[in-house]
């Protein structure tokens, strides 16, 4: 997870846009019993604030201690504040839990900027607005951190939902979701509907508003329109996928598709922006600039430094292009595309100095670690992390922000050849060469 560029909240316009229904996937397989339907108790269980993450309420220990936990599909540790910190309203007090077990092992997690460190243990964990189960899970009790907790974000820990391969200190530390599936009858799948606000929210609005849903163990029909289209999980570490083509307003970027996935492409709810590899970012910005050239935006806008503002209610959405990412499909030589609107990639930002206007930040940025499909992408879609079948599903979110002219879309199938060649193979360090 790109810690430090964190995420947005709820939709102004809900429901299926203009009754739009996408063509149903022709080869859709029959669903497994209990995998689909209504999960009323889990709908609307996420809250969040623009740029600062979506969080779910969890309880830890006996008696239960309630904490808000950031939902992060870009990491694999369950880690919670366990000592006083100026940005934390509350923290996990291990000494008050009769079920806490110390693993007598430390964990240190450095980020590009900042870090957290703590002590490993296990305790009983449940999700009040989740499945009615309690599991014994590994917990990293954060005792020291730098640039990790965010002032005013309202979360006190992080729930890493990715795979054991990227868990710290090593892959022997079982992630929370693995423990949940092993210890209960919850199916090995979860789905996320992150709802972007379309307008900035102040602190009191955030606390009172809904940020979306994390459905644990299933798929909720009410959260999406049209069909779910699935892309294979390339490798079980991050939620890695393969992008095979990129279009801006229907115009192909015409790059070698390896560039789109250099050095990987991941789906990460813990990152705010759509982050693109340098060459891809430059090509995309050039194309978006050309498409929106009726207005002259400052260079700082494309860098994410300057806001652009319009008189309230007059944002010219139509001058900005849609962005389509084609993802490898489940069938050989078949792909599908997901299309986002400027309502997803222009992030509303409140600034008192320009409060009479609607102001936005450009939420596409450059990456040196591959493509990161962060909240900017996820807020357009209902995203199914089908771990059991090693695939990720996308459907148009019932809460995505759009206008009367355009809507986010998930469409297919498209014929795309040689998609395997689009994946980048990260050179493996040969352990034996490190021996002295």
């Amino acid at each position: 997870t790109q810690h430090g560029i964190r995420l947005p909240l709820r939709s102004g316009l809900g429901g299926a846009p203009l009754g739009l229904r996408l063509p149903r996937e022709t080869d859709e397989e029959p669903e497994e019993p209990g995998r689909r339907g209504s999960f009323v108790e889990m709908v609307d269980n996420l809250r969040g604030k623009s740029g600062q993450g979506y969080y779910v309420e969890m309880t830890v220990g006996s008696p239960p201690q309630t904490l808000n936990i950031l939902v992060d599909t870009g990491s694999s540790n369950f880690a919670v504040g366990a000592a006083p910190h100026p940005f934390l309203h509350r923290y996990y007090q291990r000494q008050l839990s009769s079920t806490y077990r110390d693993l007598r092992k430390g964990v240190y997690v450095p980020y590009t900027q900042g870090k957290w460190e703590g002590e490993l243990g296990t305790d009983l964990v449940s999700i009040p607005h989740g499945p009615n189960v309690t599991v014994r899970a590994n917990i990293a009790a954060i005792t020291e951190s730098d640039k990790f907790f965010i002032n005013g974000s309202n979360w006190e820990g992080i729930l890493g939902l990715a795979y054991a391969e990227i868990a710290r200190p090593d892959d022997s530390l079982e992630p929370f979701f693995d423990s949940l599936v092993k210890q209960t009858h919850v199916p090995n799948l979860f789905s996320l509907q992150l709802c972007g606000a379309g307008f900035p929210l102040n602190q009191s609005e955030v606390l009172a508003s809904v940020g979306g849903s994390m459905i644990i163990g299933g798929i909720d029909h009410s959260l999406y329109t049209g069909s779910l289209w699935y892309t294979p999980i390339r490798r079980e570490w991050y939620y890695e996928v393969i992008i095979v083509r990129v279009e801006i307003n229907g115009q192909d970027l015409k790059m070698d598709c390896k560039e789109y996935n250099y050095d990987k492409s991941i789906v990460d709810s813990g990152t705010t922006n759509l982050r693109l590899p340098k060459k891809v970012f430059e090509a995309a910005v050039k194309s978006i600039k050309a498409a929106s050239s009726t207005e002259k935006f400052p260079d700082g806008f494309w860098l994410g430094e300057q806001l652009v503002c319009w008189q309230a209610g007059t944002t010219p959405w139509n001058i900005f292009p849609v962005i389509s990412l084609y993802l490898m499909g489940e069938v050989t030589n078949q792909s599908f595309r997901i299309t986002i609107l400027p309502q997803q990639y222009l992030r509303p930002v409140e600034d008192v100095a320009t409060s009479q206007d609607d102001c936005y930040k450009f939420a596409i940025s450059q990456s040196s670690t591959g493509t990161v499909m962060g909240a900017v992408i996820m807020e357009g879609f209902y995203v199914v992390f089908d771990r059991a079948r090693k695939r990720i599903g996308f459907a148009v979110s019932a809460c995505h922000v759009h206008d009367e002219f355009r809507t986010a879309a998930v469409e297919g199938p498209f014929v795309t050849l040689d998609m395997e060649d689009c994946g980048y193979n990260i050179p493996q360090t040969d352990e034996s060469t490190l021996m002295t």
């Epitope: 560029i5 964190r6 600062q52 900027q113 965010i150 002032n151 002259k296 503002c309 600034d351």
Partner: antibody, heavy 116, light 107 residues
């Protein structure tokens, strides 16, 4: 209320270095970049560079690349500017300012005097 | 670098007058121009952004206009508290640059 609180005046010797600070409050610190500017009497305002508090990415005016280094501490919502190898040319008033559209908010100024 | 030129260094006006401060960019900067007021011994105060938008709390006596290369800050019904230096700034491209300033004196 948005505020940028700058550190106090500095009297430094030629060849020495100095570190100025700018503590932000009243907004989400990681949402907006911080800029540093220089003003000498009769020479107007000059933009030194900027830093993104969310990931410490920096961009400098070529003219100040060898002179200024910007850093950030998000835990205290503070941005720093380190000025090295000071000469009389560096005697000036320095400002931090917050981005948004242009520079809506400015710090209260820090006077740096370089004198033997 | 883009050069911002404020050709008038000083302007003298009486209370109640209207004054126009001009600024010329050496190349097209669209509408990406801001204006600041700086009183003696103080930090600059933001007045105008996007060439013509007033920042919150700025009196409507201050208006901005222009696009491309020519920009104007107009102060109508000048008050004694308007005694200050006025700077234009382009934020269209890096490095950001400022005009040399125009000092408004009150007769």
């Amino acid at each position: 209320e948005v505020q940028l609180q700058q550190s106090g005046p500095e009297l430094v010797k030629p060849g020495a270095s100095v570190k100025l600070s700018c503590k932000a409050s009243g907004y989400t610190f990681t949402n907006f970049w911080i800029h540093w500017l220089k003003q000498r009497p009769g020479q107007g305002l000059e933009w030194i560079g900027m830093i993104d508090p969310s990931d410490s990415y920096t961009k400098y005016n070529q003219k100040f690349k060898a002179k200024a280094t910007l850093t950030v501490d998000t835990s205290s919502s503070t941005t720093y500017m380190h000025l090295s190898s000071l000469t009389s040319e560096d005697s000036a008033v320095y400002y931090c300012a917050r981005s948004g559209v242009a520079f809506p908010y400015w710090g209260q100024r820090t006077l740096v005097t370089v004198s033997a | 670098d883009i050069v911002m030129t404020q050709s008038q260094k000083f302007m003298s006006k009486s209370v109640g007058d209207t004054v126009s401060v001009t600024c010329k960019a050496s190349q097209d900067v669209g509408r990406n121009v801001a204006w600041y007021q700086q009183k003696s011994g103080q930090s600059p105060k933001s007045l105008i952004y996007s060439a013509s938008h007033r920042y919150s709390g700025v009196p409507d006596r201050f208006t901005g206009s222009g696009s491309g290369t020519d920009f104007t800050l107009t102060i109508s019904n000048v008050q004694s508290e308007d005694l200050a230096d006025y700077f234009c700034q382009q934020y269209n491209s890096y490095p950001y640059t400022f005009g040399g300033g125009t000092r408004l004196e009150i007769k």
